[in-house]
Amino acid sequence: KLLQVSTIAMQQQEKLIQQERALLNFTEWKRSCALQMKYCQAFMQNSLSSAHNSSPCPNNWIQNRESCYYVSEIWSIWHTSQENCLKEGSTLLQIESKEEMDFITGSLRKIKGSYDYWVGLSQDGHSGRWLWQDGSSPSPGLLPAERSQSANQVCGYVKSNSLLSSNCSTWKYFICEKYALRSSV
């Protein structure tokens, strides 16, 4: 009789352990669901607010036609500047026209004044040709005014209303560019 009671007690204890395990799993699952719910709500809120604002450019970016521009507040070398832009889903500024150049230099005058800003222009070491980072050549009116005498790699930057060249390892501000979001309306 005592053995029977002891066996029943052990079975009950085993059941209790299983139930505790199930409860623990359920709590974990519930926590995971709550976390996912929170994430989904945040995502929905972001989507709705961005749809409501229908802003073609992110906060702190400037819009001009189909482009958004970000003027950095930190200095970095050219290659690090490129990395910083890529992290934002953008590339270093690529100036396609005199109109775009005028907009950029005008905006810089308002924001910061006469500093140096890296753009996505670099000189091919083999040919000495200037190329934008997508591989295209700048239009004749948008070539850096001075040839840098650096033995190192040479990159382009904007200062005041000029396009100039410098050793890519010098520290400057930089400008990123991405396409503006098109309104679906």
Epitope: L86, G89, Q133, D134, K178
Partner: nanobody, 121 residues
Amino acid sequence: QVQLQESGGGLVQPGGSLRLSCAVSRNFFSINAMGWYRQAPGKQRELVAAITNGGRIAYGTSVMGRFTISRDDAKNTVDLQMNSLRPEDTAVYYCNAKAIPVYGSTVEDYWGQGTQVTVSS
């Protein structure tokens, strides 16, 4: 777990071509840019080519006109077509994603394990 899986490396003669491919095997909240970097022995890792989520492209100066990057958002892959290969292109090529992880809020760099490209006769 593996997040970025490269394929397509190997030995090729100067002037030859190779195509590298990279597949993303993990979910991200968003991928801002994907691309390829390379590292030759004794040298720093350098950008070869990158493409942003908006389709903007950046190439390393030394590969312009020879390499072409493309991205398939539906398959979450990024390819690098390498033509007119030179001995100085010899390096380990790494796939990279600049992405915001699920439940994250900041962009992080994710790297593949690398694939060797050797250009030699």
